[in-house]
Interface confidence: low
Amino acid sequence: LCQGSNYSTCASCPSCPDRWMKYGNHCYYFSVEEKDWNSSLEFCLARDSHLLVITDNQEMSLLQVFLSEAFCWIGLRNNSGWRWEDGSPLNFSRISSNSFVQTCGAINKNGLQASSCEVPLHWVCKKCPFADQALF
């Protein structure tokens, strides 16, 4: 069994927790309610997951199939440049960064957008099937 970082590549484990969707080698949780960015992050962390970190355009395209025009918080912030919560830079997609206030990232079916972190939005958590099962 794998263990360790939430950000690692997951093994193809058989199932996801209740109300989570299995897609590829990960489990995704699409919220019904809305929270600000920080509260969304806390929600995910409390469930052994993290706010969605997208690894590449392929994953983004796959996920956008499940999204509407409503925006969802993801694990993306502008800290001296747009970075994912695992510390990696955003390097496969465009997002505008021309505001003091819009420093958190969200996604909808059309792509990535910046927003004020205080705005309540839906959110997406991501984790390996079964808690803490990440592959080194």
Partner: antibody, heavy 119, light 107 residues
Framework: QVHLQQSGPELVKPGASVKLSCKAS????????ITWVKQRPGQGLEWIGW????????QNSEKFKDKATLTVDTSSTTAYMELHSLTSEDSAVYFC????????????WGQGSTLTVSS | VIQMTQSSSFLSASLGGRVSITCRAS??????LAWYQQKPGNAPRLLIS???SLETGIPSRFSGGGSGKDYTLTIISLQTEDIASYYC?????????FGGGTKVEIK
């Protein structure tokens, strides 16, 4: 529903200063920054600058760097723009507007304040 | 600074007719475009953001399209209440910049 209420018309002399106000109601004042836009009679729209009410940070366009000073009073949820060294070129309608959730477009506008600079 | 050009200052159309207002950016703006309607003596009103997303409460006869540098606002069945000036605005780069406006009139 967000509402932006601007101060009334002003008639001022050349060389003077004027302070326009924009009172916000109906939503969290500090969540979105407030923008100011100029429109001369029969002309288009020109961005002046914006202010982030949460911490008072401002950014002006190059053209208005020395012309406009933007401030906020969070206790009264009011944004202000002071225009300095007025000339006839500053005669215009000035709008305040709230920035949209997903970018610097402007989703709620005040009704506009008319400034006339004349001796 | 990105320049926004609305090639037509005036457009005439018949009531019930179709109107297309064009806007060209001097550089790519990646759909970071808004459209506003302004009637005389009033503040601008946001119609569309993100080049295509209609704001809540805006009639469905309005639509936005385009990509890259070229964008269009279309009114499919012109009503008397649509007589106004229309402005595009890019928000890909700071400063945000507006087009010069297109005034729509009845033919």
């Amino acid at each position: 529903q967000v509402h932006l209420q601007q101060s009334g018309p002003e008639l001022v002399k050349p060389g003077a200063s004027v302070k326009l106000s924009c009172k916000a109601s109906g939503d969290t004042f500090t969540t979105y920054d407030i923008t100011w836009v100029k429109q001369r009679p029969g002309q288009g729209l020109e961005w002046i600058g914006w202010i982030y009410p949460k911490d008072g940070r401002t950014q002006n366009s190059e053209k208005f760097k020395d012309k406009a000073t933007l401030t906020v009073d969070t206790s009264s949820t009011t944004a202000y723009m002071e225009l300095h060294s007025l000339t006839s070129e500053d005669s215009a309608v000035y709008f305040c507007a709230r920035r949209g959730q997903f970018g610097p477009y402007f989703d709620h506008w005040g009704q506009g304040s008319t400034l006339t600079v004349s001796s | 600074v990105i320049q926004m050009t609305q090639s037509s200052s005036f457009l005439s159309a018949s009531l019930g007719g179709r109107v297309s207002i064009t806007c060209r950016a001097s550089d790519h703006i990646y759909n970071w475009l808004a459209w506003y309607q302004q009637k005389p003596g009033n503040a601008p009103r946001l119609l569309i953001s993100g080049a295509t997303s209609l704001e809540t409460g805006i009639p469905s006869r309005f639509s936005g399209g385009g990509s890259g540098k070229d964008y269009t606002l279309t009114i499919i069945s012109l009503q008397t209440e649509d007589i106004a000036s229309y402005y595009c605005q890019q928000y890909w780069n700071t400063p945000p910049t507006f087009g010069g406006g297109t005034k729509v009139e009845i033919k």
